[in-house]
């Protein structure tokens, strides 16, 4: 898979492959995988990809199911890259406060908050 | 501050306090704090709260600015709790795939993806 494929296209294709291979993936009825209990997905990327790893090790490889796991591995690579960018730029306090304000604003309006 | 205050109310109050104390917080003109370079805030919570720690250590405490940092510490506590909930429940593959599909769907529609 060329890593040059835009990440947005990669995600779309992965969603389609996930749908296609669902029957094969759920064949193991005794397997249990940790599932986050809330919808703030970005907080749980580590656990999600650990789960994908567990699933991959239990799935017969070959054909396009292999492509599914390759895609998921590229998505992980993208997210790891984004995480690296969390601390790259050192800026003045004012700019940090603008980012913090935006973060809290998004938390206020978009997060699913259970008290 | 009672920890029983709903997190959503806590975030709103913190936004107001941030605005109130901005002048005091930016007084240190030479301080530099890492600022994430993308809008996927949830991926960067660790770095954001490290930055808050740096800022707190450089800010003269007292009055309601103390309340601001207490609030931010409670928000961190809430987020840490959410992170713990990422791997608490072990579920069948089918349920994991539903979560994965939702995660990729949200990534597809809501994340700010730069190729």
């Amino acid at each position: 898979i060329p890593t040059e494929i835009p990440t947005s296209a990669l995600v779309k294709e992965t969603l389609a492959l996930l749908s296609t291979h669902r029957t094969l993936l759920i064949a193991n009825e005794t397997l249990r995988i940790p599932v986050p209990v809330h919808k703030n997905h970005q907080l749980c990327t580590e656990e999600i990809f650990q789960g994908i790893g567990t699933l991959e090790s239990q799935t017969v490889q070959g054909g396009t199911v292999e492509r599914l796991f390759k895609n998921l591995s590229l998505i992980k690579k993208y997210i790891d890259g984004q995480k690296k960018k969390c601390g790259e730029e050192r800026r003045r306090v004012n700019q940090f406060l603008d980012y913090l304000q935006e973060f809290l604003g998004v938390m206020n309006t978009e997060w699913i908050i259970e008290s | 501050i009672p920890t029983e205050i709903p997190t959503s109310a806590l975030v709103k109050e913190t936004l107001a306090l941030l605005s109130t104390h901005r002048t005091l917080l930016i007084a240190n003109e030479t301080l530099r704090i890492p600022v994430p370079v993308h809008k996927n805030h949830q991926l960067c919570t660790e770095e954001i709260f490290q930055g808050i720690g740096t800022l707190e250590s450089q800010t003269v405490q007292g009055g309601t600015v103390e309340r601001l940092f207490k609030n931010l510490s409670l928000i961190k506590k809430y987020i840490d709790g959410q992170k713990k909930k990422c791997g608490e429940e072990r579920r069948r593959v089918n349920q994991f795939l539903d979560y994965l599909q939702e995660f990729l769907g949200v990534m597809n529609t809501e994340w700010i993806i730069e190729s």
């Epitope: - | 002048t23 003109e29 370079v37």
Partner: antibody, heavy 117, light 109 residues
């Protein structure tokens, strides 16, 4: 490498509104590490900071121009814009857009705007 | 608001050292940035955070800052250094950018 390009009319009539757009390429305007700024330079004079904006919409303006200036951002187009109202001949200048981290990192090439009837 | 004062012009012979000053109240407590601007071109950063050089800027360019004066020093001046030089600081309350009036460096000869 981030590149910035100013666009807009080179001639504006007195009392009208000057409107310029800056298109950012080679980087995202949603980059949390940057503000997006406008600076101008009157003929033969020094640089004058007009204002800047964060991707979230937070704006900061030069107090001497604040009453006439509006800076906005369009993250979907990777652009930010300047509007300066009630212009006079004193607003004739080269207008630059620039990315602003701890300093002005990247600049547009500048566009001359003349205010004349 | 905060004011930065620069001499309008400085002249120097090739090979000599040019010093361009930037005055401001207690400027030593701020970070100072210096830009070089040649005719018809956009400014280019030559010194940031008082004395640090961006990559690609010759070692001949250096800066210092203390008390009420920041100084840009260009040693072994070359004809190609002829340009306008502007200092810049942040005025933190509220977060505004301030430029000096600019200094025209003329290389004699």
């Amino acid at each position: 490498q981030v590149q910035l390009q100013e666009s807009g009319p080179g001639l504006v009539k007195p009392s009208q509104t000057l409107s310029l757009t800056c298109t950012v390429s080679g980087g995202s305007i949603s980059n949390g590490g940057y503000y997006w700024s406008w600076i101008r330079q009157h003929p033969g004079k020094g640089l004058e900071w007009i204002g800047y904006i964060y991707y979230s919409g937070s704006t900061y303006y030069n107090p001497s121009l604040k009453s006439r200036v509006t800076i906005s951002v369009d993250t979907s187009k990777n652009q930010f814009s300047l509007k300066l109202s009630s212009v006079t001949a004193a607003d004739t200048a080269v207008y630059y857009c620039a990315s602003l981290g701890n300093w002005f990192d990247y600049w547009g090439q500048g566009t001359l705007v003349t205010v004349s009837s | 608001s905060y004011v930065l004062t620069q001499p309008p012009s400085v002249s120097v012979a090739p090979g000599q050292t040019a010093r361009i000053t930037c005055g401001g109240n207690n400027i030593g407590s701020k970070n100072v940035y210096w830009y070089q601007q040649k005719p018809g071109q956009a400014p280019v950063l030559v010194v940031h955070d008082d004395s640090d050089r961006p990559s690609g800027i010759p070692e001949r360019f250096s800066g210092s800052n203390s008390g009420n004066t920041a100084t840009l020093t260009i040693s072994r001046v070359e004809v190609g250094d002829e340009a306008d030089y502007s200092c810049q600081v942040w005025d933190s309350s509220p977060d505004h950018v301030v430029f000096g009036g600019g200094t025209k460096l003329t290389v004699l000869g």
